[in-house]
């Protein structure tokens, strides 16, 4: 066969679907690789061909579109499973071609089993809710295109294993789940089960997502430098090790980049001719506020080093702050010569 532009196996789009549920999978060529859509390609006389490689096999084979009840079908640039089976797992390829043009891409599809409490190896999307922020909603994800707008599905929401009804601050509202006032106790996995009829059959779509309650923007502040501070003086003798921790608290801020850095005499530590090492550790609170600690260390400090200014800087979307460490050379204690005068007393 003639040459085909092969985009390889697109592992970025690791598609996971539940067993015994409908799945609609769009050919990734039009979404991520080509500059035109399916309609344009179709009008230009290009044909979309699907085939697959079963799990643990090397042989590419055509997809059987003649299964009972049209279990697998293709519609435009979508491959449909109504429903999936466990052994549908494999690498799927969509190829767009005519006599002069060819382009193809493969992607992995994994059919996943779930237990009665919706536990599974499925990678779950995370939805962040602000703590005590007023009404916030999550929406049952990835259900568009499964049924026409004329069909009114039934939607049941679960938290973990439990059906959500008569919960204090969580109210199911069709495709949405409303949190009246999100609290830490609302952290967990939430599942919507969408049930709809199609051609005399009933299908279920199960979608689970993780809700994580995070710090509210109402409470967000610029970074707070806890150390260095005015109360601690780093008093060292030449030759000793100088260790200065910079500890910074960052409020949780959606999509904010938290940065901490040291300067020595205003410069990047790498640009100074001293042997400096900086080690960083990061910890998070339950609401994803972050504490970063960067420890600056100079193994054998010189008297020149003790005259420099060591400043810790921090920045987030809320602002920038800086704090200088109080570093000084230890004044050696004076050495007293004690003279003992011995008096001989005559009696």
């Amino acid at each position: 066969s003639e040459r085909c532009d092969d985009w390889g196996l697109d592992t970025m789009r690791q598609i996971q679907v539940f067993e015994d549920e409908p799945a609609r999978i769009k050919c990734p060529l039009f979404e991520h690789f080509l500059k035109f859509n399916y309609s344009t390609a179709h009008s230009a006389g290009l044909t979309l061909i699907w085939y697959w490689t079963r799990q643990d096999r090397d042989l590419e084979e055509p997809i059987n579109f003649r299964l009972p009840e049209n279990r697998i079908s293709k519609e435009k640039d979508v491959l449909w499973f109504r429903p999936t089976l466990l052994n549908d797992t494999g690498n799927y390829t969509c190829m767009l071609r005519n006599t002069t043009y060819c382009s193809k891409v493969a992607f992995p599809l994994e059919v996943v089993q779930k237990d009665s409490c919706f536990n599974s190896p499925m990678k779950l999307p995370v939805h962040k809710l602000y703590i005590e922020y007023g009404i916030q909603r999550i929406t049952c994800p990835n259900v568009d295109g499964y049924f026409p707008s004329s069909v009114k599905p039934t939607i049941t929401w679960y938290m973990g294993c439990y059906k959500i009804q008569n919960f204090n601050n969580v109210i199911p509202e069709g495709m949405n789940l409303s949190f009246l006032i999100a609290l830490i106790s609302n952290n967990g996995n939430y599942t919507c089960v969408v049930t709809y009829p199609e051609n005399g059959r009933t299908f279920h779509l199960t979608r689970t997502l993780t809700v994580k309650v995070v710090g509210s923007p109402k409470n967000a502040v610029p970074p707070v430098i806890h150390s260095p501070n005015d109360h601690v003086v780093y008093e060292k003798e030449p030759g000793e090790e100088l260790l200065i921790p910079c500890t910074v608290y960052f409020s949780f801020l959606m999509d904010s980049r938290n940065e901490v850095w040291w300067t020595i005499d205003g410069k990047k530590p790498d640009d100074i001719t001293i042997d400096v090492t900086i080690n960083e550790s990061i910890s998070h609170s339950r609401t994803e506020d972050e504490t970063r600690t960067q420890i600056l260390s100079i193994k054998k400090v010189t008297s020149e080093d003790l005259k420099r200014s060591y400043v810790c800087h921090a920045r987030s979307a809320k602002g920038e702050v800086a704090k200088a460490a109080k570093v000084k050379q230890k004044v050696p204690a004076p050495r007293y010569t004690v003279e003992l005068a011995c008096g001989f007393g005559a009696t």
């Epitope: 610029p222 850095w261 300067t263 205003g266 410069k267 990047k268 640009d271 200014s309 400043v311 800087h313 920045r315 602002g319 920038e320 702050v321 800086a322 704090k323 200088a324």
Partner: antibody, heavy 118, light 112 residues
Framework: SVEESGGRLVTPGTPLTLTCTVS????????MIWVRQAPGEGLEYIGF?????RAYCASWAKGRFTISRTSTTVDLKMTSLTTEDTATYFC????????????????WGQGTLVTVSS | AQVLTQTASPVSAAVGGTVTINCQSS????????LAWYQQKPGQPPKLLIW???SLASGVPSRFKGSGSGTQFALTISDLESDDAATYYC????????????FGGGTEVVVK
């Protein structure tokens, strides 16, 4: 080093672009500030550009002055110049590596003189 | 816009003496400490002395001391030398946005 250029005698209303050429450091590491000084007067802040490339201008300069940069130059574009804009224009580098604000600047050019006169 | 008000000019003192220049901000500077002090002599660009309210810039003698926080700052020059005769400026950065940086009006120091 930092060096300003582009200052000259112009008539009111004329646009003018001043260029600050830097060497020995990266503009991705340091913020740059523009400051001016009218004859016999104090220093006046015009605006700055942060290491990330975002530029800010003083409220009085907004709309008339814009700051932009390339990899080795920082430009100050001025429009609708008036006699009040007569000054020596300085460009300076922030003293502090990677800081947003160049309020503390250690590397200054000698300045370029802009005279607006009819 | 933010305003930095400095001690009125001129301030004079004898060689070997001490001078203090105050700088008051109409609003707290960023982080309460984003304030710098400069020295400027005629025909020269400013020279950075102090940054972060009290940190000495490289190569600046320890006779220059910055202090203060929030809205009130001071520059103290001790053991005055004739070479210290110059105009001194404070400069602040404000967190509201970049358009709100400012210089003080300057204070001339005369050394007798």
């Amino acid at each position: 080093s930092v060096e300003e250029s582009g200052g000259r005698l112009v008539t009111p209303g004329t646009p003018l672009t001043l260029t600050c050429t830097v060497s020995g450091f990266s503009l991705n590491d340091y913020a740059m500030i523009w400051v001016r000084q009218a004859p016999g007067e104090g220093l006046e802040y015009i605006g700055f550009i942060e290491p990330g490339g975002r530029a800010y201008c003083a409220s009085w300069a907004k709309g008339r002055f814009t700051i932009s940069r390339t990899s080795t130059t920082v430009d100050l574009k001025m429009t609708s110049l008036t006699t009040e804009d007569t000054a020596t224009y300085f460009c300076a580098r922030s003293y502090v590596f990677y800081s947003t604000y160049p309020y503390a600047s250690d590397l200054w050019g000698q300045g370029t003189l802009v005279t607006v006169s009819s | 816009a933010q305003v930095l008000t400095q001690t009125a000019s001129p301030v004079s003192a004898a060689v070997g003496g001490t001078v203090t220049i105050n700088c008051q901000s109409s609003q707290s500077v960023n982080g309460n400490n984003y304030l710098a002090w400069y020295q400027q002599k005629p025909g020269q660009p400013p020279k950075l002395l102090i940054w972060l309210a009290s940190s000495l810039a490289s190569g600046v003698p320890s006779r220059f001391k910055g202090s203060g926080s929030g809205t009130q700052f001071a520059l103290t020059i001790s053991d005055l030398e004739s070479d210290d005769a110059a105009t001194y400026y404070c400069a602040g950065a404000y967190s509201t946005s970049g358009e709100e940086n400012a210089f003080g009006g300057g204070t001339e120091v005369v050394v007798k």
